[in-house]
Structure formats: structure tokens, C-alpha cells
């Protein structure tokens, strides 16, 4: 047992049919000694009496708000929350696993540049009694400091029968050099409760790994005279790391039919200008990615043809 | 400590063309390595992450961009001496800074030509004969130390009398081949940055 | 104490379907991931599918995906695998079993697949 | 398709000690725990050791597991007649679990 903060307490449970569960010693947070007696949560049933309670924890119905009372007034509480621990193995029943990039990916985090800001997201199909908290850290072993907001929700979808809820958070490293070499990772760590179910979630990585720019932005097309050529120019995101000739992108330009069967024309370009044939009914797309370490391509910007 | 903005005479910058073909050779040989030593730990994320320049060179600080000097966090307090000779901008203009900068790079090289060079004599003599270091790669170094042009002492290649355990040999050459990435990154960052200046 | 108790194997023609059950007894079923596992004659050990305690997820081995379905009902105790387009190869002893450090099984069905 | 590998069979004579190795990689053994399972003829596997070493009641103490680096085992030292059976280890692979990864299973025969 551990506390997660102030009259918050985490039961670590192996969990499997028939376990014998946790011997648990509550204390009442009081200076009485005598007429002291224990409920849980709406329960005016008497657990027992005294100072201490000691309980066997195994399942749910174990759980919950534990008060000490003395002469009907509240003395204090205590809350036990489970951690299951299914065959060596932490639960996680209430994040999904979002599959990308790998499997039992349940926290998803980009940059849009080298700032030391970036943002963590992770999805869900519960919708109350939920609660998130994250900490960070560059490094476990001797952490430097990382700070992020409070989990918000930020979208709703529906998939199939299910409504699925993603939640995000924004952090950011607190003495970041964007042209830093990095060698220790930065850890995201999330702490999820569900009803009486404690959860936590860990990411590792390196901002140059998360790194996904914005796409690039004014996309121009340019008629060249006599010709079913364009000129197509662009500029770099505003939020990427500067200066440009350090932190250089490099560019993807594609030329896309109406049909998504149409073949499709690319160019690739380390200049923030190209020449392509604009087809009719087509549209062209231009998308960014760090020129010297390969991470994600930014999404599209397009502009049509016409 | 931080690069000037300096204005060399257009096509001056052959170590831009150099950076970049070493920066591909490395990719190459780090994404060959994975593959090759699929059942040992050598992806990013199960290595450690060791730089065998560090407290020897400081090329981050000594080629940060000008536009990067204001930033605090970017100002380490490591300093260290380099010999200030480099050809590579073939400009009367090349500061001392810029200097400073390039021989950090060079001095870099050096250090990862050398580790190279005794972690392939090693693998060499590994009877599975499963990889050895890419030439081209020792090529490239070599050529963007030429470009370089810093006269400097030769380091002697390490030599070891015990036998090589070549399991630990290849995990340091995973280890090695991401820092050297990462350094290479760098170093095109910075190729780029004084290419336009 | 836990018990499983599984029905419904027999022989059955390549192509056609068998719904296995198992039930539960001596637990809170509806709070523990349950296993199916298989094993041919004379072979090894082979996991066949999992489903989480609440049923919201399923996991099968990919020489079963898309032909057999695992489900449960926690108002009846059950566990459940619905065979369909069987073949020869899925001829086996079929166990249930709890998820867990500790795991109980069921006594095992013996499904063959023949012509 | 089995991902960890055993022995097909060993032997010994009663009171030696029988050793059975199971092998695999990084992201099963080598990131999860193992277990060890006896199964006698016609009957329904038996857990023998779970979390790499750990005994459940019941089972004789004269069963170890142990567990290094992308490796197992299980030994049984003074081997009795009754431990004629199958034995099969069993891990997860971290990006496949909750699926559960079986060893090939080794047939230990109790000589004499």
C-alpha cells in the first residue's frame, strides 16, 4: 500500500480468482483514542471499532472511502484504491491501446518543434469518474524538471457502438536548448483513476523522436507563361524552431486527381519553391519533415489546381 | 561561442556537400546495424545513450547559432581549447569562433575515426563474421576531415591484447553508431547554418 | 473454491460451426480475463483467445482470427467460443482458463473435425 | 509458430536432478514472467511455478524455477517417478499480451 496524495491510498493487488488479497491497517487521524468507529463509503454499517481498523483487501467491494467517526462527527477519512496486477503484468483497462506507432501504445506525445514543448495525448471509452494526473521528468534517475498542464478533455468520436474520449496535456521542459544533443529521455508518467480503480501510464522518448512540424504554411500557386507548368511556393510553419538554415525542413510536393486512384506525382525538395504540371480537377499538397532526423511528416497543406 | 553571421563567397562551402554524404553514410550503416543485430539490444530505446566526445569537444556550445546565444539554457559552461586554422570556408573571413567550431567538429571526427577503426579490427576477428563497419562511412569521415583541413595530433589507434568479447563489441557499436547520428545531425545543422550565412 | 466446467465439443464436419461453454463457479466471474487454450494430439500447447473481465476486448491467435468468436456472459457465469468454417487442424482438446499468476482450467472438450 | 523453445524430452533416474531450459527472446522472456506447467496424460495442464520462481501451495518444494536474462528453467531435484509428464513454460510478449506464449513442451522421462 502507498499513498497517491493526502488520504489517498493505493492497494497493489495480485489479481486472480480466490487470491488472498492485502492485509490493510487504516489509522484514524485523530488524537481520541476511545468511542472510535469505522464505515465505508454511504455504509452506516459498523466495520469495527478502535484507533485502527485492519482489513482484507481483494476485491472492489473492498474498496472505497473508509471514515472514522467518534459521537457522529467525522474524524477522517481514508481512500483505498486498487492497482490489479494480473499475472506480473499492470492492468490497463482504462486507457486503449492506440496500436500506433506499436502495440501497447497508450500514451501518443509530438512536438511541432525543438522548444522542449510538446503534447501527450491518449484515448478511452469511459466517460465518468475519471480522473487524470501527469507528471514528467528528462530522465528518472536524476530528473530535470518538466511541467504540464492538467489533462483535458479534447475530442469525442464515435466508433462503431462505442463513444471514444481523448484526453490531452501540454508540456513543457523547463530549461530547453532546441539545438541540444539529447541523451536522456524525457519520461511522461500518467496516473488514471477510474471509480475505485488506480491505473498508471509511462512514455519515453526524445523530443527529436516526437518531433511532427506543422504544415507548411501560405501555399501559392504560380502560372508559368505558356505553359501547363505552376510555380508552387510555401514558407515554414510559424511554430517551427528557428533559424531555418539551422534547423532545416526538407518538403514533399504531391500533385493528387479528383480520384484517389489517379496516380500520384512527387516531388521532394529541400526549397521552399517548386515547379509542377497542375492538372485539371487536381490538387497540390505540400508537406514539411525535419531535413537531418527523419521523424513524422507534418500533415498536408493543399491548395486546387484551378 | 556562438557562431557570427559570416558572408562567404557563394560555392566556398565544400564541407556542406561532405556533411551531408556523412550524415546518409551513418543512417546507412545505424539502419544496417539494426537489421544485422536484430537480437541484440540496439534500437534507441534499449541502449544507452553515451557521447565519447563529451567534456573532449563541446561542438553543441562552440556552433550554437547566433540567433540561440540568447537563450540561457543553451549556455553551458563548458569550455575547451581548439586549434584555429580551418580552411573549410577558404575565406579570409572565417572568425575565431567559426574556427572554434569547426575544429570541434574535426576533433569529433577524429575521435569517432578512431573508435571505428578499433571496433572494426575487433569485428573482423568475430567468427560469426556477422558486420563489420561500412567502408564508405570511414570514407566520408575521412574526406570531411580533409575538407576540414585542421592540422592536429595523430591519435594512435587503441590497441588490446584480450580477447574481444563480441557480443559487448556490437552493443558498443550500436551505441556508438547513435551518438555519431545524432553528432552527424548536428554537424549538417551547422553546415547549413554557416552555408547560409 | 474455483471451478470450471466446460460443454459442448464433439465431432463436427470440416466448414461447419460448434459453440463451446464454459462455466464458472466459486468466483466473482465478472471481474477476471478469460482464456482459451488448445491442444492438438499429441502436440503442444496453444492459445486460441482471451477476453478482458468486462468484455470490451478480444484477443485471438491468428490461425483463428475471423472464424472463431469469444464472448461471456457475467449474468450467467459463462464463457464462450463460437467456432465457425472449422477445419481439420482445429481437431484438439479445448481448455478454459482463468488470467492470472495463479490460473485454474477447465477439464477440457475434445472437438474433432472430420469428414 | 512457438516463439519459446524447450528440450523435446530429458531423462533421469530417481533422486537425480532433471533440468528443463526454455528459450526466448527480449521481448517475452526477457521483459516478462514465466511460468512452468506439468501435464500428465489426458488430464488438464498444472501450474508448477509462476513469476520466474515463485511456488503455488501444494506444489513440492523439490520444483525451482529460475530465470536469466532471455532465458528459463525449471529443475527438479530428486526426480520421483510421478514427475513422469510434460512440461511446458509459458511467458507474454510485450507487444502481443494479453496472448499467451507456450513453449514446445519437453516429455520428461523418469528412467528405471
Known amino acids: 500500500i502507498w499513498e497517491l496524495k493526502k488520504d489517498v491510498y493505493v492497494v497493489e493487488l495480485d489479481w486472480y480468482p480466490d487470491a488472498p488479497g492485502e492485509m490493510v491497517v487504516l489509522t484514524c487521524d485523530t488524537p481520541e483514542e476511545d468511542g472510535i468507529t469505522w464505515t465505508l463509503d454511504q455504509s452506516s454499517e459498523v466495520l469495527g471499532s478502535g484507533k485502527t481498523l485492519t482489513i482484507q483487501v481483494k476485491e472492489f467491494g473492498d474498496a472505497g472511502q473508509y471514515t472514522c467517526h467518534k459521537g457522529g462527527e467525522v474524524l477522517s477519512h481514508s481512500l483505498l484504491l486498487l492497482h490489479k496486477k494480473e499475472d506480473g503484468i499492470w492492468s490497463t483497462d482504462i486507457l486503449k491501446d492506440q496500436k500506433e506507432p506499436k502495440n501497447k501504445t497508450f500514451l501518443r506525445c509530438e512536438a511541432k518543434n525543438y522548444s522542449g514543448r510538446f503534447t501527450c495525448w491518449w484515448l478511452t471509452t469511459i466517460s465518468t469518474d475519471l480522473t487524470f494526473s501527469v507528471k514528467s521528468s528528462r530522465g528518472s534517475s536524476d530528473p530535470q524538471g518538466v511541467t504540464c498542464g492538467a489533462a483535458t478533455l479534447s475530442a469525442e468520436r464515435v466508433r462503431g457502438d462505442n463513444k471514444e474520449y481523448e484526453y490531452s496535456v501540454e508540456c513543457q521542459e523547463d530549461s530547453a536548448c532546441p539545438a541540444a544533443e539529447e541523451s536522456l529521455p524525457i519520461e511522461v508518467m500518467v496516473d488514471a483513476v477510474h471509480k475505485l480503480k488506480y491505473e498508471n501510464y509511462t512514455s519515453s522518448f526524445f523530443i527529436r523522436d516526437i518531433i511532427k512540424p506543422d504544415p507548411p504554411k501560405n501555399l501559392q500557386l504560380k502560372p508559368l507563361k505558356n505553359s501547363r507548368q505552376v510555380e508552387v511556393s510555401w514558407e515554414y510553419p510559424d511554430t517551427w524552431s528557428t533559424p531555418h538554415s539551422y534547423f532545416s525542413l526538407t518538403f514533399c510536393v504531391q500533385v493528387q486527381g479528383k480520384s484517389k486512384r489517379e496516380k500520384k506525382d512527387r516531388v521532394f525538395t529541400d526549397k521552399t519553391s517548386a515547379t509542377v504540371i497542375c492538372r485539371k480537377n487536381a490538387s497540390i499538397s505540400v508537406r514539411a519533415q525535419d531535413r537531418y532526423y527523419s521523424s513524422s511528416w507534418s500533415e498536408w497543406a493543399s491548395v486546387p489546381c484551378s | 561561442r556562438n557562431l557570427p553571421v559570416a558572408t562567404p563567397d557563394p560555392g566556398m562551402f565544400p564541407c556542406l556537400h561532405h556533411s551531408q554524404n556523412l550524415l546518409r553514410a551513418v543512417s546507412n550503416m545505424l539502419q544496417k546495424a539494426r537489421q544485422t543485430l536484430e537480437f541484440y539490444p540496439c534500437t534507441s530505446e534499449e541502449i544507452d545513450h553515451e557521447d565519447i566526445t563529451k567534456d573532449k569537444t563541446s561542438t553543441v556550445e562552440a556552433c550554437l547559432p547566433l540567433e540561440l546565444t540568447k537563450n540561457e539554457s543553451c549556455l553551458n559552461s563548458r569550455e575547451t581549447s581548439f586549434i584555429t586554422n580551418g580552411s573549410c570556408l577558404a575565406s579570409r573571413k572565417t572568425s575565431f569562433m567559426m574556427a572554434l567550431c569547426l575544429s570541434s567538429i574535426y576533433e569529433d571526427l577524429k575521435m569517432y575515426q578512431v573508435e571505428f577503426k578499433t571496433m572494426n579490427a575487433k569485428l573482423l576477428m568475430d567468427p560469426k563474421r556477422q558486420i563489420f563497419l561500412d567502408q564508405n562511412m570511414l570514407a566520408v569521415i575521412d574526406e570531411l576531415m580533409q575538407a576540414l583541413n585542421f592540422n592536429s595530433e595523430t591519435v594512435p589507434q587503441k590497441s588490446s591484447l584480450e580477447e574481444p568479447d563480441f557480443y559487448k563489441t556490437k552493443i558498443k557499436l550500436c551505441i556508438l553508431l547513435h551518438a555519431f547520428r545524432i553528432r552527424a545531425v548536428t554537424i549538417d545543422r551547422v553546415m547549413s547554418y554557416l552555408n547560409a550565412s | 473454491q474455483v471451478q470450471l466446467v466446460q460443454s459442448g465439443g464433439g465431432v463436427v464436419q470440416p466448414g461447419r460451426s460448434l459453440r463451446l461453454s464454459c462455466a464458472a463457479s466459486g468466483f466473482t466471474f465478472s471481474s477476471y480475463g478469460m482464456h482459451w487454450v488448445r491442444q492438438a494430439p499429441g502436440k503442444g500447447l496453444e492459445w486460441v483467445a482471451f477476453i478482458r473481465y468486462d468484455g470490451s476486448n478480444k484477443y485471438y491467435a491468428d490461425s483463428v482470427k475471423g472464424r472463431f468468436t469469444i464472448s461471456r456472459d457475467n449474468s450467467k457465469n459463462t464463457l464462450y467460443l463460437q467456432m465457425k468454417s472449422l477445419r481439420a487442424e482445429d481437431t484438439a482438446v479445448y481448455y478454459c482458463?482463468?488470467?492470472?499468476?495463479?490460473?485454474?482450467w477447465g477439464q477440457g472438450t475434445m472437438v474433432t473435425v472430420s469428414s | 509458430s512457438y516463439v519459446l523453445t524447450q528440450p523435446p524430452s530429458v531423462s533421469g533416474t530417481p533422486g537425480q536432478r532433471v533440468t528443463i531450459s526454455c528459450s526466448g527472446g527480449r521481448s517475452n522472456i526477457g521483459s516478462n514472467h514465466v511460468k512452468w506447467y506439468q501435464q500428465l496424460p489426458g488430464t488438464a495442464p498444472k501450474l508448477l511455478i509462476y513469476?520466474?520462481?515463485q511456488r503455488p501451495s501444494g506444489v513440492p518444494d523439490r520444483f525451482s524455477g529460475s530465470k536469466s536474462g532471455t532465458s528459463a528453467s525449471l529443475a527438479i531435484t530428486g526426480v520421483q517417478a510421478e514427475d513422469e509428464a510434460d512440461y511446458y513454460c509459458?511467458?507474454?510478449?510485450?507487444?502481443?499480451?494479453?496472448?499467451?506464449?507456450f513453449g514446445t513442451g519437453t516429455k520428461v522421462t523418469v528412467l528405471g
Open positions: 509459458q511467458s507474454y510478449d510485450r507487444g502481443t499480451h494479453p496472448a499467451l506464449l
Open positions: 482458463k482463468t488470467h492470472g499468476s495463479h490460473d485454474n
Open positions: 513469476g520466474n520462481d
